[in-house]
């Protein structure tokens, strides 16, 4: 028996369902009573789901997995993972045993888009050219860790005096806070771009300082 899985990682958004594809080629006369199917975490061998003795043995993994029972006899051993969490990320091995056996691993990459950044300024009044200001760009509930880029109004990257921190919450999602310290010119626009490297999703925020008032 030869097991086939997707070469590319499966990308799944947090709280959505994901399908980890796995297939095998049944011989003529194959019956489900002959099938021994195991899905397990590759790195720990923790059992996720199994089908043996002609019966779906069910989920051994937080009751969020399911097979496609009507398709098994055709060689479809794919696994449905419901309500994906950050902690589900990793490699899953599909192991098929009939007379002989084979296995293959598929990677699950979890992602969550970042919110539109909010911009804050400190100090936020009585600003004069030459003043040092701190601009904070905050974006929330994304995964995996973001890449943060700052630019001025002319699109020139600002790399000096940037401090970025990323903190995971109890669900494993990241809140990003990036701080730019800059000396004000006569006027100027400062924009922050928060990029999710897996989704290739960019979230933009900007602040324009034109004497008074400020625009966000």
């Amino acid at each position: 028996v030869e097991v086939q899985v997707s070469e590319d990682p499966v990308v799944a958004l947090v709280d959505t369902d994901a399908t980890l594809r796995c297939s095998f080629s049944p011989e003529p006369g194959f019956s489900l009573a002959q099938l021994n199917l195991i899905w397990q975490l590759t790195d720990t061998k923790q059992l996720v789901h199994s089908f043996t003795e002609g019966r779906d043995q069910g989920s051994a993994y937080s009751n969020r997995t399911a097979l496609f029972p009507d398709l098994l006899v055709q060689g479809n051993a794919s696994l449905r993972l419901q309500r994906v969490r950050v902690t589900d990320e990793g490699s899953y091995t599909c192991f098929v045993s009939i007379q002989d056996f084979d296995s293959a691993a598929v990677s699950l990459q979890v992602a969550a888009p970042y919110s539109k950044p909010s911009m804050t300024l400190e100090p936020n009044k009585d600003l004069r050219p030459g003043n040092m200001v701190t601009i904070t760009c905050s974006s929330y509930q994304g995964y995996p860790e973001a890449e943060v880029f700052w630019k001025d109004g002319q699109g020139v990257p600002l790399t000096g005096n940037v401090t970025t921190s990323q903190m995971a919450n109890e669900r494993g999602l990241f809140d990003v806070h990036s701080v730019l310290r800059v000396v004000l010119g006569a006027n100027g626009t400062y924009s922050c771009l928060v990029r999710n490297p897996v989704l290739q999703q960019d979230a933009h925020g900007s602040v324009t300082i034109t004497g008074q008032p400020l625009t966000f």
Partner: antibody
Framework: EVQLLESGGSLVQPGGSLRLSCAAS????????MSWVRQAPGKGLEWVSG????????YYADSVKGRFTISRDNSKNTLYLQMNSLRAEDTAVYYC???????????WGQGTTVTVSS | QSVLTQPPSASGTPGQRVTISCSGS????????VNWYQQLPGTAPKLLIS??QRPSGVPDRFSGSKSGTSASLAITGLQSEDEADYYC???????????FGGGTKLTVL
């Protein structure tokens, strides 16, 4: 040729420590889980410990938990078993075995003898 | 007491067929590969059969089968050099441990 060669076994007093090594050759060591299995004189085979290919996951038999530590150095193609607080009942031939993707210990070393006695 | 249950001994005359049984549970043999090892006196165990698959170099006189939570090893055309200890083993995903049978001593009469 695929080979596993254990070393480090010796006579040690109860309460003492010992580190066993297993040198692997002839295969991509870093791609395989590995195990230690022991056999007391005149007795059957008893699994001791296992470790994932990267070393991130480790498992132990209840009889050695908290006393033995399995580790590996993939750059040296070597598996280790650090044995502390040794007891007379740890006296055995210790084998290292390759543990493949199909849950088969398919290659075994020739074994190294550990004797715990005062 | 072993998690997998094997008879302690078995015997047969040259040319005969003998079988050795191994009984386990749903968390080991029931869904995991069952392996059979031959250990000749004074030597390391050698893999003989996995489920019903023989590694290259193992004579086809040896065969394995598995049904439910039990497995068996059959040896046909018994030879004197088959006199050895035979062990079944499987990964147990409830215990997170390898489990072995107690071993069966095969005597060729």
């Amino acid at each position: 040729e695929v080979q596993l060669l254990e070393s480090g076994g010796s006579l040690v007093q109860p309460g003492g420590s010992l580190r066993l090594s297993c040198a692997a050759s002839g295969f991509t060591f870093s791609s395989y889980w590995m195990s230690w299995v022991r056999q007391a004189p005149g007795k059957g085979l008893e699994w001791v410990s296992g470790i994932s290919s990267s070393g991130s996951a480790t498992y132990y038999a209840d009889s050695v938990k908290g006393r033995f530590t399995i580790s590996r150095d993939n750059s040296k193609n070597t598996l280790y078993l650090q044995m502390n607080s040794l007891r007379a009942e740890d006296t055995a031939v210790y084998y290292c075995a390759r543990w493949n993707d199909y849950d088969i210990m398919d290659v075994w070393g020739q074994g190294t003898t550990v004797t715990v006695s005062s | 007491q072993s998690v997998l249950t094997q008879p302690p001994s078995a015997s047969g005359t040259p040319g005969q067929r003998v079988t050795i049984s191994c009984s386990g549970s749903s968390s080991n043999i029931g869904r995991r590969t069952v392996n059979w090892y031959q250990q000749l006196p004074g030597t390391a165990p050698k893999l003989l059969i996995s489920n019903s698959q023989r590694p290259s170099g193992v004579p086809d006189r040896f065969s394995g089968s598995k049904s439910g939570t039990s497995a068996s090893l059959a040896i046909t055309g018994l030879q004197s050099e088959d006199e050895a200890d035979y062990y079944c083993a499987s990964w147990d995903d409830s215990l997170n441990a390898w489990v072995f049978g107690g071993g069966t001593k095969l005597t060729v009469l």
